[in-house]
Each structure stands twice: as C-alpha cells, then as structure tokens.
Interface confidence: low
Amino acid sequence: DWVVAPISVPENGKGPFPQRLNQLKSNKDRDTKIFYSITGPGADSPPEGVFAVEKETGWLLLNKPLDREEIAKYELFGHAVSENGASVEDPMNISIIVTDQNDHKPKFTQDTFRGSVLEGVLPGTSVMQVTATDEDDAIYTYNGVVAYSIHSQEPKDPHDLMFTIHRSTGTISVISSGLDREKVPEYTLTIQATDMDGDGSTTTAVAVVEILDANDNAPMFEPQKYEAWVPENEVGHEVQRLTVTDLDVPNSPAWRATYHIVGGDDGDHFTITTHPETNQGVLTTKKGLDFEAQDQHTLYVEVTNEAPFAVKLPTATATVVVHVKDVNEAPVFVPPSKVVEVQEGIPTGEPVCVYTAEDPDKENQKISYRILRDPAGWLAMDPDSGQVTAVGTLDREDEQFVRNNIYEVMVLAMDNGSPPTTGTGTLLLTLIDVNDHGPVPEPRQITICNQSPVRQVLNITDKDLSPHTSPFQAQLTDDSDIYWTAEVNEEGDTVVLSLKKFLKQDTYDVHLSLSDHGNKEQLTVIRATVCDCHGHVETCPGPWKGGSGGGGSGAGVIAVIVVVVIAIVAGIVVLVISRKKRMAKYEKAEIKEMGEMHRELNA
C-alpha cells in the first residue's frame, strides 16, 4: 500500500550519510515506471535538503544529523509520478519523529537564589523554590527529568542538615529546629540539579538563605486617639494618618505595619493602607460619606506587622472619630433613568409625564427643572413641577431622532443652594405606534413587454409597526384597472402587477392604492414603461417592427382603416375633450391595438 508508518530517527546520528530510512513504494510500478519525490519543510523548503529520496528506487534518505531540540518532528509528503509526469498516487504523509538523546545538561534559572526564613521556625517550613530546566525530553524519556539535591551547607551550625530540598519541585524547607539569627544570620547552600531523574548530568548553583529576625515587638499607636473632619460624598479623601512605633528592625516585615479597621465601619466606607515610606496608616474614604445619614463615625483601627508575632503580644488599637462635614448636594432624579410610554403624534400641549428629583440635603431646597437635551425639540418641562409636555409632533418613524422606538431626552434639576448644584436625569420615551403611514410599493418604476408580459412583483413597505402593517390590500384606481391587474400575494407583503391588455410602446401611469391591516390607504403612481417585446425586458429595445403585410389589396385596406381610425380619433377627441388627459395614451394604444389586430388578420 502507498502508506508509510511514522519513522523514528535518533538525533545526533553518526551516519554514514546519506542514510537510508525507508522505501516509498507504489504498486502502480507494475504498469509503468514510477519516479518518486518528496516535498515539505526539510525536503524542498527550509531547512532544505535534510531529507531526499532516490528518484527511481523510492528510498528515503537522511542527509545529515538531526537535532530534536531544534525540530522534533518533520512532516513530509511523498509523491509518485509516471514517466510522462502524471501523478499515479495521492500525496502521502511521511512523519519523521526525532527521538531524544541526553545531549543537554540541566541549567539553573539563576546562578544564585535568595530566600529567607524566620529564626526559630518549625521543621517543615518552606523557605524558597529553585528551578532548573533541561532542554531534553522529559515526557517520553528521563533525559530531561531533573532531580534536585543539596550538595553542601555552610556553615554547618548547629549541624550540617538544617535544610532539605524536594527532589522534584525544588522547594527548600527547614528540616531541623535551631535556626538562630544571632548565631548564624545566613546559610549558603550548594544545590544540584541532575537529569535522568538523578542519574545523569549534574549542574550546580547557590542558594542563600537569610535568617530573619523574629517579630517580638508589636507596633504601638502614638497617639491612640484621633479626630478628623471629612466633607461628605468625597471618595478617596485622606481622612487621617495614624502613626505607630515599632522596636523591630526598621523596614523589615517585623517592623512594617499592617492596619485593619476592626470596628465602626459597618457600611464599609473606609479603607486603610500602609504608607510605604513612613509606615503610617493612611485612612481614606472608600465610599462617599453621607452627612444626612450619619454625621459621625467612630472607627477602631488595629495594627499588626507584615510578619506574624513570634511570641504572644498585645495588638494595639487606635480610635478615630470622623466628623462628616455637610456640603450642598446635587438633586437626584428618581429614577435616574425614567422610561415612559407615550403615543406618537399626541396633540401639542398634551402632558407626557412628571419627572422630578429629590435633594439629598436636609434643608428644604427649591428645585427647578429644564430640558438639557431634546434633539427634535418635541418637549417642554415646567420649571417648578417637572411636568413634561409635548410642544412638537412626536414621530416614532423619525429615524434621525428615534432609535428602536425610543426617544431619549436629558433633563436637568437645579437646587437653590449656595452654590447651586445640578443633577441630570434621562427620560426615555417609548413611542407607541399609531397607524400614520400607509403602505408603499417598491420599486415605483417598472418596464414590461406588451406581448406575453412578465408579472411585475413589487415589495410593499409600511413604516408602522404590526398590527398596522400586513396583510395589505391593493386596488387600481383612475381607470388603471382597464389595462392592469394588481394582486397581493398570499403572505400579504408583495403586490403583483400584470398587463392584461395590449398597450403600445410608451410610458404609462398606473394608479395603485395600497391599504394596510388598519385600513390606512396610500395612493402611489407607478411609472410603467411598456416595450414592444415578448416576455421579460430590462429596457426597451429599438422601434418595434410589425409582421410584413400581405399583397396590395391588403395595403389598400390598411390605408382605408388608417383614414377611418384618424376620423374616429378626431371624433373621440371632440366628444371626450373634458376627459382626463392621462387616458389619451390608453386611447391611442387601443387604436393601435385595432391596427395590430387588422395586420394580424391580413397576414
């Protein structure tokens, strides 16, 4: 079969090259001489020439040693063609998998790692993690599987096995008790990473373990009581800086303060952070305070250190009394965004809704209203009551101002505080549809043949919403029904216009009346270009030539008929002079129709 199983080739092969790997063979070689070729990265595209194929025998050749860490798999295609160059087989996938050799040593990510641990910690305490990588394969072989070990520890006090390293993860932990910073402030560990899961090549690095001072002094507030004044509503306002002293090593985790609000902040209004330089607790507002709801907050703040206490110590607590200062607050519309349903086209002066705001301040401030943004200029707002009325015609179908049936208005409320403040609200008028648009056909110009004419399908559109739309009804007016028929389809959303009588080539007005489900009627004039042609037409062809007449007698008869027709036409013009001019074409067409009929008889 024209199939090759995946081929495994070890990296770093010694040759000799070219080295035969596998033979491509097509069973079509019984019928014709076959020539073999390969394509793909490693053959005819970069890295070119790694692989080749003996053209006539099909032997797949390796031209040089492979490097798995560079390319771990090659995907080639084998081709077989006959002597005349015609392909005799579909291209065949050839997968060449480069198998790993342990040709890389592990490498630590750093030459020196640094970690720290508190003095006096219990065995099992994690100190740090070191990492080594190996480019070799660690999935299918152990070539890249790294095992960690500690080669040596300096100094060896109180003994030489103070630390251990997890052979797989590289996590260094305390294994013995007795870490004493005063005796040994720092240990240097020589660490090893060995591939083959501990049986292969080894590399070394250094891990420095700093022994930290234990946190045996608690931070203390100085002073313990604070008083602060904060304007209401301000977020991120610095309320107070709380100062602590700590006898532990400055700028160490045992000295750096961590502050917590432990009481008095049920509303979660405050937050406290540690200033990175001064170590002070910076108390700020997380939410705006509300003078009207609570004019004073008594907070209890506790301070600890970044590092846990090494011995049992009392945790200091400070009291912060926060006085809230009153400020004039902006009126707030209730709700901030109000949705009101209103019928389009309501009379001018008709009330739409009342939209009012509330003032958060305790004083009974007067609120006045005005419209801030009314794109179409349809509304007015009473400054005292907040009553919104229509001053223009609300039109749901106005695409410039109305989106998805919604007309958006922004209103403003202003109090009479000192200084005055303003608040805005959004009024979303959902315009309820009324049947104020009749249906219209599209297109309004048609071209049609006067012989075997194709029915013209016109789409019907109505700007209104259901139920003021389909099903539609169609009717021809102003005598258009003499020559035309109009029929609405079963779905009720298109109208079919047909020519039912012969008309001569010319342009005609078809008066089409369409009405919707709510009986809203719309008259549209369709401009119909009638052409001298059969069946379908886009534009009229050149002047229409009738069938050739018979002999001379025929020609004479025609001449008589023409004279008679002219006389009749003159008579009709006199008789129906008052009749609408637009019918004139249809009269002429009728006369022509008589002529055509005679011509056909003559023929």
Epitope: D265, E302, P308
Partner: antibody, heavy 123, light 113 residues
C-alpha cells in the same frame, strides 16, 4: 469565667421583638469580644454577630437589618435585640466569648459559652 | 459567605477506636501573611453548650485531652479522636473565622456502638 444569659419571656409572638441580656463575670468586656450564636431545635449553630472591645460590631448580613448588639462595660452586660421575629427564629440563643481581642489570639474562636436561653416564636 | 461542609453527618464507633471527621470550606482559610488557618472545632454534648476544642485548625485549647487532634490546611480539615471514649458522644462542629460572617459546618454526630 462565666457567661449567663438573662432573658425576657421565652415565648415571643410573631412580628414582635426579642431582647436578651448576657451578664459576664471573671473578665472585662474591654478585653474580650462577645459573640451571639443561635441553634434552632435539632439543627446546627448559626453565628449572629459580635461586639468588639471598643463597641464596634459585625453582624450576619442576612440579619443585619433587624439585629442590634450593644453593651454596658461598667455592668459587664451585653445586649441582643432582634426585631420582627418569625417562627423560623425559634432557637436557643447563646452568648460566647472570643479567645481574645487580637487576631493573634484566634479571636474568631469562642472559648466560653453561656448556657443559652430558649426562644419560641409562636402566636 | 464561606460555606463549611462536614462529613459524614453521623458515625458510630466502638470505644477505643480511632475516628476522623472531615470539614471542607468553599475557599482557602489559610492567610498568607501569618500562615495560619482560621478554623476552629467545637464539641457539643447532648443538652450542653458547645465547647472549644481546637483553634488555628490544629492548636488544642488548654484542658482539651490530647486524643483530639486537628489537622489540614487551605480548604480541607480533619478532626481526629485517636481513641474514642464513651464521654466523647457529641456533635462536632467546625467553624471558620477567616471572613464575616463566621460560619459553622452542619456538624458530625458521633455515636458510640
């Protein structure tokens, strides 16, 4: 160390309020926070709230709107007041002391508990 | 809020047997700054108030017999009674105090065969 709940009537009508007093001895309320915990009949424990040494409080969010914990340090008394009681508030109510005032003490753990007072909500 | 789940809900053992009960939290109770697990274990004997056995997940409260041992970290915790006595008949509750509101597990009822 002792905590004794002194309660009003054991029976409370629905929509009425409940008041319980916890009187402590052997330690100061300025040094130890006091928790309130309840246990419906045949069910598990439910933490209601805590009052810290400085008088600050934390409540279970579901009960916050109708629960008030206060204290009188000089009388060594802690008070629980709960409004708008319903039948599912029927339980044994305990006051319990935190191990200490500081995080280091494991102050969320409660080392001394009162004997509890039974409250039945029924019309 | 943090949800505490205890299992089994009840178990029956003979005097002298070793018993373990589990408590799982919906999030880690280990605080990285101090490497402490904010978990306590209580014992409630029939008709009595709860009694604190263990805090910080593994620290035995003074006066608690050393047959009671707490272990675990993060989200999985265990209370072990190395050799059950008849007086250990009770419901055992775990409780987290990592975040508000403090929450208890549903309890494990220990019965003596």
């Amino acid at each position: 160390v002792q905590l004794v709940e002194e309660s009003g009537p054991g029976l409370v009508a629905p929509s009425q309020s409940l008041s319980i007093t916890c009187t402590v001895s052997g330690f100061s309320l300025t040094s130890y926070p006091i928790n309130w915990v309840r246990q419906p009949p045949g069910k598990g424990l439910e933490w209601l709230g805590v009052i810290w040494t400085g008088g600050g409080t934390n409540y279970d969010s579901a009960l916050k709107s109708r629960l008030t914990i206060s204290k009188d340090n000089s009388k060594s008394q802690v008070f629980l007041k709960m409004n708008s009681l319903q039948t599912d508030d029927t339980a044994r109510y305990y006051c319990a002391r935190s191990r200490g005032a500081y995080d280091f003490d494991g102050r969320g753990a409660m080392d001394y508990w009162g004997q509890g007072t039974t409250v039945t909500v029924s019309s | 809020e943090l949800v505490m789940t205890q299992s089994p809900s009840s178990l029956a053992v003979s005097v002298g047997e070793k018993v373990t009960m589990s408590c799982k939290s919906s999030q880690s109770l280990l605080y990285s700054s101090n490497q402490k697990n904010y978990l306590a274990w209580y014992q409630q004997k029939p008709g009595q108030s709860p009694k604190l056995l263990i805090y910080w997940a593994s620290t035995r409260e003074s006066g608690v017999p050393d047959r009671f041992t707490g272990s675990g970290s993060g989200t999985d915790f265990t209370l072990t009674i190395s050799s059950v006595k008849a007086e250990d008949l009770a419901v055992y509750y775990c409780q987290q105090y990592y975040s508000y509101p403090y929450t208890f597990g549903g309890g494990t009822k220990l019965e003596i065969k």
